[in-house]
Interface confidence: medium
């Protein structure tokens, strides 16, 4: 099974070769290269020196080889870099190239969503409901769930909205939002609203959005 690797958008992924080199072979005897699942070459070290004529344009200038750890560093990660990678090592002998090692890695690229933000899109109408939108941007993969918590002195209610999502054509990052009409006809105390974004790994909470409800006015004194 391939080694699973996780790295973050715009950062660097380490793609290992995990070559034990038990025979202590010099790089000058070896051809080491990495290719992706479409057989596009990321990097080639030919007899100890990097060679670029095979490197695909999408990887050009984005890699660096660490000869101590036999690891390729892929820089400026994009979402489209996710997938399978192979490190392959050939030994150059007088009789020709002999494949002596192969290592498969599976790269997942993540991007942290921004802290969810609550924006009211209407005023409180006669203390009955409020329209609000909660949004979070520039994340990957798409989140599992987005919801709103309405907390009062006595209770907590969770509202699940329909999550709207859009994906950037270039970066492939997601922006997500939900719009809700939160009703509180019977509430007389102050409320705090939170927005929660759940991904496979994290739970992001917005800053609290407070609503201070005016106390009902007492009826005017009866004057006989």
């Amino acid at each position: 099974a391939p080694l699973k690797i996780q790295a973050y958008f715009n950062e660097t992924a380490d793609l290992p070769c995990q070559f034990a080199n038990s025979q202590n072979q010099s790089l000058s005897e070896l051809v080491v290269f990495w290719q992706d699942q479409e057989n596009l070459v990321l990097n080639e070290v030919y007899l100890g020196k990097e060679k670029f004529d095979s490197v695909h344009s999408k990887y050009m200038g984005r890699t660096s080889f660490d000869s101590d750890s036999w690891t390729l560093r892929l820089h400026n990660l994009q979402i489209k870099d996710k997938g399978l990678y192979q490190c392959i090592i050939h030994h150059k002998k007088p009789t020709g190239m002999i494949r002596i090692h192969q290592m498969n890695s599976e790269l997942s690229v993540l991007a942290n969503f921004s802290q969810p933000e609550i924006v009211p899109i209407s005023n409180i109408t006669e203390n009955v409901y409020i329209n609000l939108t909660c949004s979070s941007i520039h994340g990957y993969p798409e989140p599992k769930k987005m919801s709103v918590l309405l907390r009062t002195k006595n209770s907590t209610i969770e509202y699940d909205g329909v999550m709207q999502k859009s994906q950037d054509n270039v970066t492939e990052l997601y922006d997500v939002s939900i719009s809700l009409s939160v009703s509180f006809p019977d509430v007389t105390s102050n409320m705090t609203i939170f927005c929660i974004l759940e991904t496979d790994k994290t739970r992001l909470l917005s800053s609290p959005f407070s609503i201070e409800l005016e106390d009902p006015q007492p009826p005017p004194d009866h004057i006989p």
Partner: antibody, heavy 116, light 112 residues
Framework: QVQLVQSGAEVKKPGSSVKVSCKAS????????IQWVRQAPGQGLEWIGV????????NYNQKFKGKATMTVDKSTSTAYMELSSLRSEDTAVYYC?????????WGQGTLVTVSS | DIVLTQSPDSLAVSLGERATISCKSS????????????LAWYQQKPGQPPKLLIY???TRESGVPDRFSGSGSGTDFTLTISSLQAEDVAVYYC????????FGQGTKVEIK
């Protein structure tokens, strides 16, 4: 000694295809890449692409994608380049060259003339 | 794409005199990790394929006379023929292999 021997001159009609061969000898064929370069009459050198035989990878100059197709036959130590949809501006001498980081041995060149 | 610009386009030099050809790259050809410049020089005589003279910017290919030398780093490179001989009449090309391959437009060297 290292030798790259290319196929003979060709005269082709516009719209047709041509396949140029490059037979290698004097070294282990799978140890090196083969580059293809063209030179139009009275013009400079233009890189077409590379085929890395030791791990079956091709890379093309963007200009020649869809025009040139590079292949190899390891059993006969021969590299091929096929040019499709020929036009008069494809008239040129086509060279193969053995290469690692630079092209140290070249074929004698194949003149392809495209004329109606 | 990396663009290589040679100068001059043509050069007439007396026998025994020095000929100097410049090659400028639109981006650095120096691999900072290995300290190599991915630049080569080729000589092409009429009706013949190109012949490798210099690689890694300054390493002479075996069998090439020592009157040919290469220098430079990064974006500026020079091929020098220290004492021009009649058999040196040819077109000279620089070529980079830092990002795929490209050639300069060529410099024609003639005898004055």
């Amino acid at each position: 000694q290292v030798q790259l021997v290319q196929s003979g001159a060709e005269v082709k009609k516009p719209g047709s295809s041509v396949k140029v061969s490059c037979k290698a000898s004097g070294y282990t064929f799978t140890d090196y890449a083969i580059q293809w370069v063209r030179q139009a009459p009275g013009q400079g050198l233009e890189w077409i692409g590379v085929i890395n035989i030791y791990y079956d990878n091709t890379n093309y100059n963007q200009k020649f994608k869809g025009k040139a197709t590079m292949t190899v036959d390891k059993s006969t130590s021969t590299a091929y380049m096929e040019l499709s949809s020929l036009r008069s501006e494809d008239t040129a001498v086509y060279y193969c060259a053995r290469a690692a980081w630079y092209m140290d041995y070249w074929g004698q060149g194949t003149l392809v003339t495209v004329s109606s | 794409d990396i663009v290589l610009t040679q100068s001059p386009d043509s050069l007439a030099v007396s026998l025994g005199e020095r000929a100097t050809i410049s090659c400028k790259s639109s981006q650095s050809l120096l691999n900072s990790r290995t300290r190599e410049n991915y630049l080569a020089w080729y000589q092409q005589k009429p009706g013949q394929p190109p012949k490798l003279l210099i690689y890694w910017a300054s390493t002479r290919e075996s069998g090439v006379p020592d009157r040919f030398s290469g220098s430079g780093s990064g974006t500026d490179f020079t091929l020098t023929i220290s004492s021009l001989q009649a058999e040196d009449v040819a077109v000279y090309y620089c070529s980079q292999s830092y990002n795929l391959y490209t050639f300069g437009q060529g410099t024609k060297v003639e005898i004055k």
